[in-house]
Interface confidence: medium
């Protein structure tokens, strides 16, 4: 009385875990416990099931694997290594699965993995070799094309005694494995700064999302090498002004669209170059929405409507005249 299931619909399986690489390949039509499978769509969904480990008996046909809303905690080395390998797995979504540690080589033996989403996991410990798989100075190129790391910042009391930005960047740059990366999303991570070398080593980027962080300045960041960059999201940061060097680099990118909404722009004399640039450039999307936040007298003024007479700086008083 075993039921059959149409290949076009999701079928499923459901209870239980432990052990490493499966000694015996699963049957072609098998679906792991607590998952739903569609061989026609080459998709396996193990969603909101409180899984504590990655199922070992994933079907070899899987191209799209959703492991969202679980309680995985740790991704060990070779978490997806199977015999035979999951040679077709192209898209892996692990968002919201309470991961706090991703170890070196967690994504090894996935030769077709192009999209990886680790968003909404409190990654207190992201190994530098999570994506490269080895500590060699130059690793084998990763097949990753899209890497989604939105809201992976852990609560403050769970952060290691090191820069969170530095930890993430170390994983992005290790072994130069991500040279082929085209989309990188790092939104909502409380980034205070962007390490200066990170973009130079990701030359294939088309889309970079740094929105909803706490970036104050781009002074030391170079966009010069990102000749393929098509979109740069900087909305909802703490940017006060963009300086000449940054403006020139952005203007020099042939395909770029920049998003700058909801930053606390300081409309004083240092803003003059940016205002001039905004009036001329086509690269900023929604530039007519950009408004001043400071000083108080300029609040809510539209940047595009300012002229040089509006942009003054209070004179710096000599020390003898300063008051507390």
């Amino acid at each position: 009385s075993s039921p059959t299931s149409s290949a076009s619909s999701f079928s499923s399986s459901a209870p239980f875990l432990a052990s490493a690489v499966s000694a015996q390949p699963p049957l072609p039509d098998q679906c792991p416990a607590l998952c739903e499978c569609s061989e026609a769509a080459r998709t396996v969904k193990c969603v909101n099931r409180n899984l504590t480990e990655v199922p070992t008996d994933l079907p070899a046909y899987v191209r799209n694997l959703f492991l969202t809303g679980n309680q995985l905690a740790v991704l060990p080395a070779g978490a997806f290594a199977r015999r035979p390998p999951l040679a077709e797995l192209a898209a892996l979504n692990l968002s919201g699965s309470r991961l706090d540690e991703v170890r070196a080589g967690a994504f090894e033996h996935l030769p077709s993995l192009r999209q990886l989403d680790l968003s909404h996991n409190p990654l207190a410990d992201l190994s530098p070799f999570a994506f490269s798989g080895s500590n060699a100075s130059v690793s084998a190129p990763s097949p990753l094309v899209e890497l989604i790391l939105n809201h992976i910042v852990p609560p403050e009391d769970e952060r290691q005694n090191r820069s969170f930005e530095g930890m993430v960047v170390a994983a992005l740059l290790a072994g130069r494995a991500l040279q082929g990366l085209r989309r990188l999303e790092l939104a909502s991570n409380h980034f205070l700064y962007l390490p200066r070398d990170v973009l130079a080593q990701l030359p294939s980027l088309r889309h970079l999302d740094l929105s909803n962080n706490s970036l104050v300045s781009l002074t030391y960041v170079s966009f010069r090498n990102l000749t393929h960059l098509e979109s740069l999201h900087l909305e909802d940061n703490a940017l006060k002004v963009l300086h000449n060097g940054t403006l020139a680099e952005l203007q020099g990118l042939p395909h770029i669209r920049v998003f700058l909404d909801n930053n606390p722009w300081v409309c004083d004399c240092h803003m003059a170059d940016m205002v001039t640039w905004l009036k001329e450039t086509e690269v900023v999307q929604g530039k007519d929405r950009l408004t001043c936040a400071y000083p108080e007298k300029m609040r809510n003024r539209v940047l595009l409507e300012l002229n040089s007479a509006d942009l003054d700086c209070d004179p710096i008083l000599p020390p003898s005249l300063q008051t507390s």
């Epitope: 009385s1 039921p3 499923s12 399986s13 459901a14 000694a23």
Partner: antibody, heavy 120, light 111 residues
Framework: EVQLVESGGGVVQPGRSLRLSCAAS????????MHWVRQAPGKGLEWVAY????????YYADSVKGRFTISRDNSKNTLYLQMNSLRAEDTAVYFC?????????????WGQGTTVTVSS | DIVMTQSPDSLAVSLGERATINCRAS??????????MHWYQQKPGQPPKLLIK???NLESGVPDRFSGSGSGTDFTLTISSLQAEDVAVYYC?????????FGGGTKVEIK
């Protein structure tokens, strides 16, 4: 005809061990995940453990984790439950049951059960 | 753990009358595609027998007077016309996550 026949039950003292077996016939055993479910005297059903078709995946109820081990021998068409450190509350009829590979379908065949009594 | 609450605990129904058993899960046991809820019948001295799988799908060989419905957290087993051989304890069970849990059972008797 699908058949599941449990054996190995009996009376055992607390702290001792027992191994249950479930002999399967009438279907391709290696294609199916298998479970143990128990029922204490006069009580309801309690799921105990699961093993996937190729023995790559196991799950256990919290009440038995660390004490019970589920295993299978596909060449012998047999499912096992090794029960160590037995307690009085493990007293129950133990059923083996089959789940289809696509597991949204419930436990479609059950054995008749074997009785385990843990008593000093 | 997901708690399965069955009601009523026992039910006395006249032959030929409708019997309805409810089962409520403490959280949703349905995806957008399936409900992971099943119903079993257990007669004295026998193992449970699968009646309804995935909320509403009748298991092969089960009389069509049995039916199941529901999704999310609320599910119902209905016997449209009770027969003498339907006297048994009925259990609901989810397979949404580990551990699988069963309802406490509903004893169906003839009035």
């Amino acid at each position: 005809e699908v058949q599941l026949v449990e054996s190995g039950g009996g009376v055992v003292q607390p702290g001792r061990s027992l191994r249950l077996s479930c002999a399967a016939s009438g279907f391709t055993f290696s294609n199916f995940g298998m479970h143990w479910v128990r029922q204490a005297p006069g009580k309801g059903l309690e799921w105990v453990a699961y093993i996937s078709s190729g023995s790559s995946t196991f799950y256990y109820a919290d009440s038995v984790k660390g004490r019970f081990t589920i295993s299978r021998d596909n060449s012998k068409n047999t499912l096992y439950l090794q029960m160590n450190s037995l307690r009085a509350e493990d007293t129950a009829v133990y059923f083996c049951a089959r789940s289809p590979a696509y597991y949204r379908y419930g436990l479609d065949y059950w054995g008749q059960g074997t009785t385990v009594t843990v008593s000093s | 753990d997901i708690v399965m609450t069955q009601s009523p605990d026992s039910l006395a129904v006249s032959l030929g009358e409708r019997a309805t058993i409810n089962c409520r899960a403490s959280q949703s046991v349905s995806s957008s595609t399936f409900s992971y809820m099943h119903w079993y019948q257990q007669k004295p001295g026998q193992p449970p027998k699968l009646l309804i799988k995935s909320s509403s799908n009748l298991e092969s060989g089960v009389p069509d007077r049995f039916s199941g419905s529901g999704s999310g957290t609320d599910f119902t087993l209905t016997i449209s016309s009770l027969q003498a051989e339907d006297v048994a304890v009925y259990y609901c069970q989810h397979s949404w996550e580990i551990p699988y849990t069963f309802g406490g059972g509903t004893k169906v008797e003839i009035k």
